[in-house]
């Protein structure tokens, strides 16, 4: 459960959350469930497009997100699908294709007009004053990332790497995603056996940066497999 | 206008139950986690625990846990904390807050609960 | 638990004055730091996340600055609507934890 897994120490103790895993080119972070984040259910389609295994709609490119590829199938099983145009069924933002946010169920045009009579739909906190806001509240930068002019800085709510400023990715942090730094040569990293083996991951790092990879570290060697130590490292 | 509107003081007996209720609006209520947090007479704020409205998922600071149970109910957009074999320790101000990202960005009024025999 | 430290619990001040208050914690807590707002009243109110983003809505004059294990608050141009409790809050780790406060009051 939620509860167990954001009390157990083997979570509460992870190191510092300064950035995320290592993934397949292009991924943002190390894929983890929708945990405490709106609009986490997996929405189940047969849209099958892409059969690249998935955990979390970051796993996948602009036009995709992350479900399982037949209704009512094996939800441990998700691969990347087509997002989803205007007028089509959704659950979630992150299903509509760029340019589109979900509501009432619907992908509907996130244009500047349209969008500032339905701001309550998709209210998040501001970006540190980094996008206009109404009441306080800013925008969701997940609808579509090219609507904006600045990109959201360290620390910003994100949904998404893409919308998150160069050098940063979109990693989970708590009940949220955040903007964080990709990760320089040396730092601590993340590096999953396998696609769907790390469990819950409540603090996520970002991926190594360009030239780098997430390794055990070589003094590390000879720990036991538990406590082996990964950082980033030149190729 | 995003609000959270907390129910009204409360006087309960050493032993009992009491529950608070934290109604919002302005804002679509699965969208946001909601917060509780404590703050007893002329001390410092204590984080009780998270619900995600949209799921129901629950996570307690494990000095509340088994105590304190969060619930919302959707079709009202409202959030609520129960707090169950009071003692005199549990007098203080509880409040609710809103957010999505790791900060407690809008706050309730606060609602004050008195344990007295 | 992260400890997290107001070592000044009240602090007075003439308009105007430039004002800092600090917070400590326990151990690293890189960015993760948040600054609140209570007033009198018992309103709470956010002023600044991941250590110096201020939020939206909030005076200019208040800056957050810092990092790892020590952070501070400063607001620049005391005015009269400044007068509060002032608490700094660590979201590195489960659970969140909150200093003790710092009162401000006026001279």
């Known amino acids: 459960t939620l509860n167990s897994v954001l009390n157990s120490n083997a979570i509460k103790n992870l190191p510092p959350p300064l950035g995320g895993a290592a993934g397949h080119p292009g991924s943002a972070v190390s894929a983890a469930p929708g945990i405490l984040y709106p609009g986490g259910n997996k929405y189940q389609t047969i849209d099958n497009y892409q059969p690249y295994p998935c955990a979390e709609d970051e796993e996948c490119g602009t036009d995709e997100y992350c479900a399982s590829p037949t209704r009512g199938g094996d939800a441990g099983v998700q691969i990347c699908l087509a997002c989803r145009k205007r007028r089509k069924r959704c659950m979630r933002h992150a299903m509509c294709c760029p340019g589109n946010y979900c509501k009432n169920g619907i992908c509907v045009s996130s244009d500047q007009n349209h969008f500032r009579g339905e701001i309550e739909e998709t209210i998040t906190e501001s970006f540190g004053n980094d996008h206009s806001t109404l009441d306080g509240y800013s925008r969701r930068t997940t609808l579509s990332s090219k609507m904006y002019h600045t990109k959201g800085q360290e620390g910003s709510v994100c949904l998404r790497s893409s919308d998150c400023a160069s050098g940063l990715c979109c990693a989970r942090h708590f009940w949220s995603k955040i903007c964080k730094p990709v990760l320089k040569e040396g730092q601590v990293c993340t590096k999953h056996r396998r696609k769907g083996s790390h469990g819950l991951e409540i603090f996520q790092r970002c991926y190594c940066g360009e030239g780098l990879s997430c390794r055990i570290q070589k003094d590390h060697h000879q720990a036991s497999n538990s406590s082996r130590l990964h950082t980033c490292q030149r190729h | 206008e995003v609000q959270l509107q907390q129910s009204g003081p409360e006087l309960v007996k050493p032993g009992a139950s009491v529950r608070i209720s934290c109604k919002t609006s302005g804002y679509t209520f699965t969208e946001y986690t909601m917060h509780w947090v404590k703050q007893s007479h002329g001390k410092s704020l204590e984080w009780i625990g998270v619900i995600d409205p949209s799921n129901g998922d629950t996570s307690y600071n494990q000095k509340f846990k088994g105590r304190a149970t969060l619930t919302v109910d959707k079709s009202s957009s409202t959030a609520y904390m129960d707090l169950r074999s009071l003692t005199s320790e549990d007098s203080a101000l509880y409040y609710c807050?809103?957010?999505?990202?790791?900060?407690?960005?809008?706050w309730g009024q606060g609602t004050l609960v008195t344990v007295s025999a | 638990d992260i400890q997290m430290t107001q070592t000044t619990s009240s602090l007075s001040a003439s308009l105007g004055d430039r004002v800092t208050i600090n917070c400590r914690a326990s151990q690293d807590i890189s960015n993760y730091l948040n600054w609140y707002q209570q007033k009198p009243d018992g309103t709470v109110k956010l002023l600044i996340y991941y250590k110096s983003r201020l939020h939206s809505g909030v005076p200019t004059r208040f800056s957050g600055s810092g990092s790892g294990t020590d952070f501070s608050l400063t607001i620049s141009n005391l005015v009269q609507e400044d007068i509060a409790t002032y608490f700094c809050q660590q979201v590195h780790t489960l659970p969140p934890t909150f200093g003790g406060g710092t009162k401000l009051e006026i001279k």
């Open positions: 807050s809103s957010t999505t990202g790791p900060w407690f960005a809008c």
